[in-house]
């Protein structure tokens, strides 16, 4: 997944945000548990504005969002991104 020039980090997220990302702008979520050389859970969100950001996995809003997504029967499995694709 990492671009070849930037594989010097075992973890993909060098920093995280805790501020709320609205469900309406989220295109895709990926939750990766510890492993593959990274000791922490990482949550990566792709937005509809073509941005990719790392989010604090312990943020309360994220926990609520993941429960909401899972309740819509979208599973959040490691290395298999949860997709919420925009309607054409």
């Amino acid at each position: 997944i990492l671009e070849a020039h930037y594989t010097n980090l075992k973890c993909r997220c060098s920093g995280v945000i805790s501020t709320v990302v609205g469900l309406n702008i989220i295109d895709r979520i990926q939750v990766t548990p510890p492993g593959n050389g990274c000791p922490k859970t990482e949550v990566v969100i792709w937005t509809k504005m073509k941005k990719v950001i790392c989010v604090n996995p312990r943020a309360k809003w994220l926990q609520r969002l993941l429960r909401h997504v899972q309740s819509k029967s979208l599973s959040s499995t490691p290395q298999a991104p949860v997709s919420k694709r925009r309607a054409a």
Epitope: E3, H5, R12, W46, K51, V52
Partner: antibody
Framework: QVTLKESGPEILQPSQTLSLTCTFS??????????VGWIRQPSGKGLEWLAN???????YYNPSLINRLTISKDTSNNQAFLKITNVDTTDSATYYC??????????????WGQGVMVTVSS | DIQMTQSPSSMSASLGDRVTITCQAS??????LIWFQQKPGKSPRPLIY???NLANGVPSRFSGRRSESNYSLTISSLESEDMADYHC?????????FGAGTKLELK
């Protein structure tokens, strides 16, 4: 190995339309997260981002030029295009084709073409 | 649009000098800043991403710092191969905007 190469006219006259082509290899515009864009640099000056096009045909333009710019792509032939209408001498610059990929860490413009120099002159 | 104010526009320094270039953002961009190096006649290449992270293959004499809305690129001990133009880029939001660039020359 990722490469991008720009092509287009070296010289054109004011009021004409500039058509640029970016032909790339080593990646495809099909997969989720892949994008190609255009950046220009007038001689001896700074860089100016012009436009991006993404795998899903989402397009972003620099608002200062939005009425004159059109970006498009031909995914099957690994090409992206930029048209600038009604050019004038201030559009003289080296035009670069650039790649962006929505991975983490996100480094927009991670690969650049060699650039094509365009001169607008009457 | 977010304005990136880069300074100095040009500077000359001697080999071994410590050199610092700065960019100031007109509004909050977090760490969404990249420094590019552009050698004469060449295309730019990413040097530092997310304000402080070194791209692979970049010598450790380069470093990036952030202090609120001020971002700096420092070369701890200047080498001849570092003579180039340096550009900052904010990618917090569209339109992505560059600083005006800094030309680094040998004294």
């Amino acid at each position: 190995q990722v490469t991008l190469k720009e092509s287009g006219p070296e010289i054109l006259q004011p009021s004409q339309t500039l058509s640029l082509t970016c032909t790339f290899s080593g990646f495809s515009l099909s997969p989720y997260g892949m994008g190609v864009g255009w950046i220009r640099q007038p001689s001896g000056k700074g860089l100016e981002w012009l436009a991006n096009i993404w795998w899903d045909d989402d397009k972003y333009y620099n608002p200062s030029l939005i009425n004159r710019l059109t970006i498009s792509k031909d995914t099957s032939n690994n090409q992206a295009f930029l048209k600038i209408t009604n050019v004038d001498t201030t559009d003289s610059a080296t035009y670069y084709c650039v790649r962006s990929e929505l991975v983490m860490p996100y480094v927009p413009f991670d690969y650049w073409g060699q650039g094509v120099m365009v001169t607008v002159s009457s | 649009d977010i304005q990136m104010t880069q300074s100095p526009s040009s500077m000359s320094a001697s080999l071994g000098d410590r050199v610092t270039i700065t960019c100031q953002a007109s509004q909050d961009i977090g760490n969404d800043l990249i420094w590019f190096q552009q050698k004469p006649g060449k295309s730019p290449r990413p040097l530092i991403y997310y304000a402080t992270n070194l791209a692979n293959g970049v010598p450790s004499r380069f470093s990036g710092r952030r202090s609120e809305s001020n971002y700096s690129l420092t070369i701890s001990s200047l080498e001849s191969e570092d003579m180039a133009d340096y550009h900052c880029l904010q990618f917090k939001q569209y339109p992505y905007t560059f600083g005006a660039g800094t030309k680094l020359e040998l004294k």
